[in-house]
Amino acid sequence: GWVWNQFFVPEEMNTTSHHVGRLRSDLDNGNNSFQYKLLGAGAGSTFIIDERTGDIYAIEKLDREERSLYILRAQVIDITTGRAVEPESEFVIKVSDINDNEPKFLDEPYEAIVPEMSPEGTLVIQVTASDADDPSSGNNARLLYSLLQGQPYFSVEPTTGVIRISSKMDRELQDEYWVIIQAKDMIGQPGALSGTTSVLIKLSDVNDNKPIFKESLYRLTVSESAPTGTSIGTIMAYDNDIGENAEMDYSIEEDDSQTFDIITNHETQEGIVILKKKVNFEHQNHYGIRAKVKNHHVDEQLMKYHTEASTTFIKIQVEDVDEP
């Protein structure tokens, strides 16, 4: 019968040829009366056989990632009779893996949005690299992820590629971060190949800033002839947040005379001081009122940032009009 061994040939060999192994019949007594033949896809072009000895050689460079095994057929003939000594038999030559492929991030570009002030450990995004080498061949395709850029705000789990927050970030200081992740095969051992990817992490706004008046004192004037509903001036607060988190409502906190009102212009985020009751210079020529400003939308969980509303003082001078 045939004497079989497992046949392996390393991929990407840089020698002209490589001895793969030997086909042998146990009837072969070594007197050179047998002729071995190789048939099938790759016979004669990728693999050749020494017909006298049955030695098989790979005669071209192989790429396991292109083709990982060859199914060939073996024959052995008695030269003296021309007859087959053994039944034709199929056998396999496996191409063994070398670490010739670097990890690649196939889902680039990566982009993630995470709320500012998120706590440590918050999951941002998972990046995944793939390696074309054989996962069952040692550590050739076993990857380890590491952070090349992004400390101290981010960390990456070495085996999963999960990026997490490792330090709170304030959008009002910096609103986006570029994180660079490296994937190394061979679980990072010497001789490892690596690939990198960039992740753009944008911070979404949370309402962690209350509106604050630009001025602690506003001076306005109103003519005693002004009808009710007259706009007598504007006041303005600023809020470092953006979008709806910066929307604000102005209101009167203190006006004993109940002469004025404040309405909010939601387009400009200004407070408009309105005359609610007519004024009389001869009766009272100046008023002092206090206004306050609050965000329009405040999340319950963020109330700690909004405990005390910002206030400002408005001094209003009444202008005299000559009366007949």
């Epitope: 002209t16 056989i49 050689y57 005669i59």
Partner: antibody, heavy 121, light 107 residues
Framework: EVQLLESGGGLVQPGGSLRLSCAAS????????MNWVRQAPGKGLEWVST????????YYADSVKGRFTISSDNSKSTLYLQMNSLRAADTAVYHC??????????????WGQGTTVTVSS | EIVMTQSPVTLSLSLGERATLSCRAS??????LAWFQQKPGQAPRLLIY???TRATGIPARVSGSGSGTEFTLTISSLQSEDFAVYYC?????????FGGGTKVEIK
């Protein structure tokens, strides 16, 4: 008896082309690798190119890569070397040589007498 | 590429003497080395392949040895037909490369 007979050499101007042939007999041509080796006047041997049996794989010396093309015709048992953009440094006797068996597949066990290529203006 | 260095360049010996030719490879080529003989006006002739296997028809006085980077061709007793130029050649890596040759001449 294995025999190799080269032809196609001659005098050519720099930048010109030539096609060398090597007619083989006495063996199963498609089962062996074939080589071209050259020898400049008074110099040593220099490998030029190799083709595997059946023509699946070809290899070239850096000095001729992109200019020379090796090929074979199994039906005619003939090896060829197409030489383009010839230079004075290509002047030599060009030998074809048959590959061996097994581990000596990319060897040179039988040589032809050679054909002379002269590149000169 | 693998550089093959032969020494000596010329060897002057008498009939019946022992000739020892050396060939060194710039890196290991295992046993994938061949030796050729060339006489003036003739094609090279294969003597040895696989570092030590004699080609068909080569007399027993011609022998090869070595592996890795150091190789030797020995002709135990020089005959008149042995005076020629000898080349070593590696076939382990592309490009295939030859040594510069050793001329064995009559003293």
């Amino acid at each position: 008896e294995v025999q190799l007979l080269e032809s196609g050499g001659g005098l050519v101007q720099p930048g010109g082309s030539l096609r060398l042939s090597c007619a083989a007999s006495g063996f199963t041509f498609s089962s062996y690798a074939m080589n071209w080796v050259r020898q400049a006047p008074g110099k040593g041997l220099e490998w030029v190119s190799t083709i595997s049996g059946g023509g699946a794989n070809t290899y070239y010396a850096d000095s001729v890569k992109g200019r020379f093309t090796i090929s074979s015709d199994n039906s005619k048992s003939t090896l060829y070397l197409q030489m383009n953009s010839l230079r004075a440094a290509d002047t030599a006797v060009y030998h074809c040589a048959k590959g061996g068996m097994g581990g000596y597949y990319y060897g040179m066990d039988v040589w032809g007498q050679g054909t002379t290529v002269t590149v000169s203006s | 590429e693998i550089v093959m260095t032969q020494s000596p360049v010329t060897l002057s010996l008498s009939l019946g003497e022992r000739a020892t030719l050396s060939c060194r490879a710039s890196q290991s080529i295992s046993s994938n080395l061949a030796w050729f003989q060339q006489k003036p006006g003739q094609a090279p002739r294969l003597l040895i392949y696989g570092a030590f296997t004699r080609a068909t028809g080569i007399p027993a006085r011609v022998s090869g040895s070595g592996s890795g980077t150091e190789f030797t061709l020995t002709i135990s007793s020089l005959q008149s037909e042995d005076f020629a130029v000898y080349y070593c050649q590696q076939y382990n890596y592309w490009p295939l490369t030859f040594g510069g040759g050793t001329k064995v001449e009559i003293k």
